[in-house]
C-alpha cells in the first residue's frame, strides 16, 4: 500500500571527524522522495534530551531542540528532495563528539542510521628548508592538532629507516589552550631526495613531501580522516 | 531579493520606551535568525541579540538584557525590537539584519537601512 | 565575552594602493569572521564572511585570511569607491562581537 510508516526505506551513515572551531557535516543519505512536505528528518544524539535538528513540512522545526545546537545546525534544504539528511553543524566543539542518529519519515516509509561523530583538531603540515641550522634541515609545521599526534619522518632513498634519532619534535600549545601547533626538525638531509613529514591521530592522518634536488624544491601534502565511511 | 525595511526615526522623552519595526521580504521570514545591533558615533557598532521568527527563540548581550526586547510577527513578517527606561545613551541608529544561514546562526548578510532614535528631553 | 580588537583605526592610502585591516579576538578560536564596508547613509555590506570566502559579486581585490585569535583583511588596487569604514564581526560564538571599525581614506 505504501502507507507512511508501515515500511523500511534505506538510510546511510558516513562516519565523520569535525575540526573544532570550523564547520562540520554529518553526513546522511536516503531513498529520495519528491513529495517534500512528507518527509521528516530528525537528528539525535545519544545522552541529549531533545533533538539536534528537525526538519518538516518543507523547513525546520526547532521547538524541540536541545540549547546546546541551538542556532548551530541546518539541513540543505535544497537537497532534501533527492535524498540528502546531511546535518551542517557551526562551530564543532570537543563536546560535540558521540553517537548520532539520523531518523527518516517519507510517504515510502521510515529508517534510521547511526553514525559515530568524533571531534579534534587537523591540519596540513608544510614542509620548508631550514637554512638556519648548521646542517641541511627540513622543518615540518602544522597549526592545529587535538589530541596530541605523532610524527614520523620516512625518505625515499632509505625506506624503512628510522629517523626518531635524527629529528626533533615539539607541541606548542594554541593561545585557546586545547589545540597544539607541531613543529618536526629533521636533521643531516641529503639533496636530490624525497622526504614525508607524518602527523597522525586517532581522527586524522596529514602527510607532507618535499623534494630537494640543486635546482628546486617541491612539495605536496595531503590530510586524510580516518575512519571515513 | 532580500530587504529589511526599517520603522523611522524618533525623538523619545528619558524613562520611556520605544518600539522600532523591522519588516523583511525576499525570503522565509520564520527560516532565518534577525539579529539586531546599535551603532553610537566614535563607539563603532554593538551586538544587542537576535530572534529565531520561526520559534521565538532569542539570545541577548547580557548589557542589553531587560532593556531591549526582541519579538517576531509572523503574519505580517516583522521583527520588533521595544527599548525601555531610555538615557542619553540609548540615542543611536539601530539596525536590523537577517542572519545567513537559515537556521543556522551566520553572518550579517542584509541589513536594513537603520532606525534612528534620539533620547532627548 | 569575546572582544574583537580591531586595528588601525583609521588610515590613508593611495590609489592603486594596497592596505590591510586586523582584528583580534580576546579569547576562543574559530573561522567564524566577516567584514563589512559601511558608508555614510547606508547600510553594511558584507564582504567576506567564514576568515576567507567572498560573498558573490564581491571583487577579488577584496581579501580576508586569519587563523586562531589573529584576522585580517585586505583591500589591493584601491579605487575611489573604497573610501568607507570597514568592521570586522565576530559571528562564531553565542554572542556576537564587533571590531571597533576602520575608517579609510583614499588619496
Known amino acids: 500500500f505504501g502507507i507512511s510508516g508501515k515500511h523500511f526505506i534505506t538510510v546511510t551513515t558516513f562516519t565523520s571527524a569535525g575540526n573544532i572551531g570550523e564547520d562540520g557535516t554529518l553526513s546522511c543519505t536516503f531513498e529520495p522522495d519528491i513529495k517534500l512536505n512528507g518527509i521528516v528528518i530528525q537528528w539525535l544524539k545519544e545522552g541529549i534530551k531533545g533533538l539536534v535538528h528537525e526538519f518538516k513540512e518543507g523547513k525546520d522545526d526547532l521547538s524541540q531542540q536541545h540549547e546546546m545546537f541551538r542556532g548551530r545546525t541546518a539541513v540543505f534544504a535544497d537537497q532534501v528532495v533527492v535524498g540528502n539528511a546531511s546535518l551542517r553543524l557551526k562551530n564543532v566543539q570537543l563536546t560535540d563528539a558521540g553517537t548520532y542518529t539520523c531518523y527518516i519519515r517519507t510517504s515510502k516509509g521510515k529508517g534510521n542510521a547511526n553514525l559515530e561523530y568524533k571531534t579534534g583538531a587537523f591540519s596540513m603540515p608544510e614542509i620548508n628548508v631550514d637554512y638556519n641550522a648548521s646542517s641541511e634541515s627540513l622543518r615540518c609545521e602544522a597549526p592545529r592538532w587535538f589530541p596530541q599526534p605523532t610524527v614520523a619522518w620516512a625518505s625515499q632513498v632509505d625506506q624503512g629507516a628510522n629517523f626518531s634519532e635524527v629529528s626533533n619534535t615539539s607541541f606548542e600549545l594554541n593561545s585557546e589552550n586545547v589545540t597544539m601547533k607541531v613543529v618536526s626538525v629533521l636533521y643531516n638531509v641529503t639533496i636530490n631526495n624525497t622526504y614525508s613529514c607524518m602527523i597522525e591521530n586517532d581522527i586524522a592522518k596529514a602527510t607532507g613531501d618535499i623534494k630537494v634536488t640543486d635546482s628546486e624544491v617541491k612539495r605536496r601534502s595531503q590530510l586524510q580522516l580516518l575512519n571515513s565511511g | 531579493q532580500v530587504q529589511l525595511q526599517q520603522s523611522g526615526a524618533e525623538l523619545v522623552r528619558p524613562g520611556t520606551s520605544v518600539k522600532m519595526s523591522c519588516k523583511a521580504s525576499?525570503?522565509?521570514?520564520?527560516?532565518?535568525?534577525i539579529g539586531w545591533a546599535k551603532q553610537r558615533p566614535g563607539h563603532g557598532f554593538e551586538w544587542i541579540g537576535d530572534?529565531?521568527?520561526?520559534?521565538?527563540?532569542?539570545n541577548y548581550n547580557e548589557k542589553f538584557k531587560g532593556k531591549a526586547t526582541l519579538t517576531a510577527d509572523k503574519s505580517s513578517s516583522t521583527a520588533y525590537m521595544q527599548f525601555s527606561s531610555l538615557t542619553s545613551e540609548d540615542s543611536a541608529i539601530y539596525y536590523c539584519?537577517?542572519?545567513?544561514?537559515?537556521?543556522?546562526?551566520?553572518?550579517?548578510?542584509?541589513w536594513g537601512q537603520g532606525t534612528s532614535i534620539t533620547v532627548s528631553s | 565575552d569575546i572582544q574583537m580588537t580591531q586595528s588601525p583605526s583609521s588610515l590613508s592610502a593611495s590609489l592603486g594602493g594596497k592596505v590591510t585591516i586586523t582584528c583580534k579576538a580576546s579569547?576562543?578560536?574559530?573561522?567564524?569572521v566577516a567584514w563589512y564596508q559601511h558608508k555614510p547613509g547606508q547600510c553594511p555590506r558584507l564582504l567576506i564572511h567564514?576568515?576567507?570566502t567572498l560573498q558573490p559579486g564581491i571583487p577579488a581585490r577584496f581579501s580576508g585570511s586569519g587563523s586562531g585569535r589573529d584576522y585580517s583583511f585586505s583591500i589591493s588596487n584601491l579605487e575611489p569607491e573604497d573610501s568607507a569604514t570597514y568592521f570586522c564581526?565576530?559571528?562564531?560564538?553565542?554572542?556576537?562581537?564587533f571590531g571597533g571599525g576602520t575608517k579609510l581614506e583614499i588619496k
Open positions: 579569547q576562543g578560536f574559530n573561522k567564524y
Open positions: 567564514y576568515t576567507s
Open positions: 539584519a537577517r542572519l545567513d544561514g537559515s537556521s543556522y546562526r551566520g553572518a550579517m548578510d542584509s
Open positions: 564581526l565576530q559571528y562564531g560564538n553565542l554572542l556576537y562581537a
Open positions: 530572534i529565531y521568527p520561526g520559534g521565538g527563540y532569542t
Open positions: 525576499g525570503y522565509t521570514f520564520t527560516s532565518y535568525w
